[in-house]
Interface confidence: low
């Protein structure tokens, strides 16, 4: 019987306690490898989860998150509530970014604005809760008589803070 079980293909299970040798997986279950003694219950994409890929007899269902939520963890094991740009999710819900920080996404945490002076630059555009500051040439670079051989550093795309 062991040999017979090893011949059971994916999508079936071998149940020696009952009549089947290789029996198709019941509805809402799957076996992704051959020789299985049981079929695994399909993942159910319920509640905040929505189905991205239906379960088949040989592969599990795959889930996404419904609108207003985003995936966390391997294989979207959790759904976390979206916040607005300029906010971060805390245990008490979505909270506005504190002054000096920003978040340009619906997920994740608020991060500090870039410190332009560390790069010898000045703030060209002020930061907001939703956007990082834009750094520009230092005041010395803008003074009369400054060499124009070096073009001003291009402004970074808004919202991309250094990690």
């Amino acid at each position: 019987l062991q040999d017979l079980c090893s011949n059971c293909p994916a999508g079936t299970f071998c149940d020696n306690n009952r009549s089947q040798i290789c029996s198709p997986c019941p509805p809402n279950s799957f076996s992704s490898a051959g020789g299985q003694r049981t079929c695994d219950i399909c993942r159910q994409c319920k509640g905040v989860f929505k189905t991205r890929k239906e379960c088949s007899s040989t592969s599990n269902a795959e889930c996404d998150c419904i609108s207003g939520y985003h995936c966390l963890g391997a294989e979207c094991s959790m759904c976390e509530q979206d916040c607005k740009q300029g906010q971060e999710l805390t245990k008490k819900g979505c909270k506005d970014c504190c002054f000096g920080t920003f978040n340009d996404q619906k997920r994740g945490i608020c991060r500090p604005w870039t410190n332009c002076s560390l790069d010898g630059k000045s703030v060209l555009v002020n930061g907001t809760k939703e956007r990082d500051v834009v750094c520009g040439p230092s005041p010395a670079d803008l003074s009369p008589g400054a060499s124009s051989a070096t073009p001003p550093a291009p402004a970074r795309e808004p919202g991309h803070s250094p990690q």
Epitope: L4, R18, S19, Q20, I21, C22, S23, P24, P26, P27, S29, T38, C39, I41
Partner: antibody
Amino acid sequence: QVQLVQSGAEVKKPGASVKVSCKASGYTFTNYPMHWVRQAPGQRLEWMGWSNAGSGNTKYSQDFQGRVSITRDTSASTAYMELSSLKSEDMAIYYCAREGVAGAFDIWGQGTVVTVSS
Amino acid sequence: DIVMTQSPLSLPVTPGEPASISCRSSQRLLHSNGFNYLGWYLQKPGQSPQLLIYLGSHRASGVPDRFSGSGSGTDFTLKISRVEAEDVGVYYCMQPLQIPYTFGQGTKLEIK
């Protein structure tokens, strides 16, 4: 289409044996177990046993142990049920039924009437 | 052996009305894989039984959606949302969890 066709009615004397055949068509015979169920007049359905059509393994209800034999001929896609030492209580309609999935008998034969009379 | 008990044994119903049949097992029919191993069959007059519901609540292919199965463990129910004339016959529950597979005594549905 998928179907099970059973042999015709039988009239037997007490103490004799009867062998009922069940020919499968429309599917791979060896992929599904075959069960036998009987129904005496006015009685509930009664499960007799099964044969794994692939391996030939069988399992019988204790109520029929020693009197029933379930066999199969894979080349003919046919299952057989033989019941010996017939008694008047064995008068019934005998059905073969395919187990499609998870113990569900999804296809049934048309039934074979077995009469036991002296 | 697992004993299957159905009620009622006789069920007169007016066409268009709902009907409900109960099946109770002497042992739990819930397998460790999460499925309830219980089937429902209809035997129309002069015909072989036909599969309606398997694994407690899954409708067999071609079965009208007015038939539904529910329950878990030891208590199961077959419901017909709106009975039609063609639904007459004897309804049986069956457990395929343990050998010997056993049937209920049957519920005869008839039209009033």
